[in-house]
Interface confidence: low
Amino acid sequence: SITGISPITESLASLSTYNDQSITFALEDESYEIYVEDLKKDKKKDKVLLSYYESQHPSSESGDGVDGKMLMVTLSPTKDFWLQANNKEHSVELHKCEKPLPDQAFFVLHNRSFNCVSFECKTDPGVFIGVKDNHLALIKVDYSENLGSENILFKLSE
């Protein structure tokens, strides 16, 4: 359960991979596509609104957070659209939705011991947003080796 419906804080940041590729969003045929690409230096990075929520219960058994509390985030690159986990297709998609947001839009935020974070599906513990063949996908990770998978590490920059 998420403590309170309102986020405890929000921030606007651009999202890039461990290898410094940018996560970009493009409107195509009335739907948003998500790309992982090398940006030319002069091109502006897309920003994502991260809304942080506090949850009282760990989403998976792997390495409990401090006092069992965790931060959950939702990611919105543009008004009314949120990143969502599609566990059946192992995909990450952008969907237009109204609040209250569905569980698929919530991700447990893992602060990693680099300048990186990871996003674990609230609905599927042990499954993370990751990079696969130059697009975002859901990747199952053995969480106990929590620095191991570079493809699930992301950098947030203002």
């Epitope: 804080t9 760990p58 058994e61 792997s62 390495g63 409990d64 957070g65 401090v66 006092d67 965790m70 931060l71 447990v108 935020l109 893992h110 602060n111 990693r112 011991s113 680099f114 300048n115 969480y143 106990s144 080796e145 929590n146 620095l147 191991g148 950098k155």
Partner: antibody
Framework: EVQLLESGGGLVQPGGSLRLSCAAS????????MHWVRQAPGKGLEWVSS????????YYADSVKGRFTISRDNSKNTLYLQMNSLRAEDTAVYYC????????????WGQGTLVTVSS | QSVLTQPPSASGTPGQRVTISCSGS????????VSWYQQLPGTAPKLLIY???MRRLGVPDRFSGSKSGTSASLAISGLRSEDEADYYC???????????FGGGTKLTVL
């Protein structure tokens, strides 16, 4: 009760060796990154080394690289620090600490064990 | 010398508000979460604040943390005699691939 208990400290001569142990209880040890942190008498905290849950990822402070070796035995719920070529400046209280993996914060600390390097 | 810079000492009278600063760089505080620890004389450090501004369960709300750019701070309001201790900040440093602590601040309650 979640607990970390260090042992193995003592007096050792410069150039000597010592092996510290940290026994964990009350939590699933095999799921956590573990760290050693030390504190010289009257000084601040200094991070020494860390090891991932399955020993795949190991990091050391420059000051101990090549002399100290961190290891763990998940079947025994125990963390180790093998200290070789000890110097006077290694004299300190050595703490083992658990990294709360979702937080990058040391949420559980042992009580510490004193290592004195002196002739 | 510590990578993160803290004032060596701070003081205040009971009831006062005291702030302890922790200054770093873009490779540590600028990019990573900061945590704060309290160490009472003769005891192991104790976690107070994690993820830069999240108070650990059981820690009085008199303690609060914040982060801006490459600096972080710990604020203690309604100072009490039992707050007299050493306080340390902590972060991961990307360039060093190491944990870095501040040098510690000795808080005296006058």
């Amino acid at each position: 009760e979640v607990q970390l208990l260090e042992s193995g400290g003592g007096l050792v001569q410069p150039g000597g060796s010592l092996r510290l142990s940290c026994a964990a209880s009350g939590f699933t040890f095999s799921r956590y990154y573990m760290h050693w942190v030390r504190q010289a008498p009257g000084k601040g905290l200094e991070w020494v080394s860390s090891i991932s849950a399955r020993s795949s990822y190991i990091y050391y402070a420059d000051s101990v690289k090549g002399r100290f070796t961190i290891s763990r035995d998940n079947s025994k719920n125990t963390l180790y620090l093998q200290m070789n070529s000890l110097r006077a400046e290694d004299t300190a209280v050595y703490y083992c600490a658990r990294l709360a993996t979702r937080r990058d914060a040391f949420d559980i600390w042992g009580q510490g064990t004193l290592v004195t390097v002196s002739s | 010398q510590s990578v993160l810079t803290q004032p060596p000492s701070a003081s205040g009278t009971p009831g006062q508000r005291v702030t302890i600063s922790c200054s770093g760089s873009s490779s540590n505080i600028g990019r990573n979460a900061v945590s704060w620890y309290q160490q009472l004389p003769g005891t192991a450090p104790k976690l107070l604040i994690y993820a830069s501004n999240m108070r650990r369960l059981g820690v009085p709300d008199r303690f609060s943390g914040s982060k801006s750019g490459t600096s972080a701070s710990l604020a203690i309001s309604g100072l009490r005699s039992e707050d007299e201790a050493d306080y340390y900040c902590w972060a991961w440093d990307d360039s060093q691939k190491a944990v870095v602590f501040g040098g510690g601040t000795k808080l005296t309650v006058l």
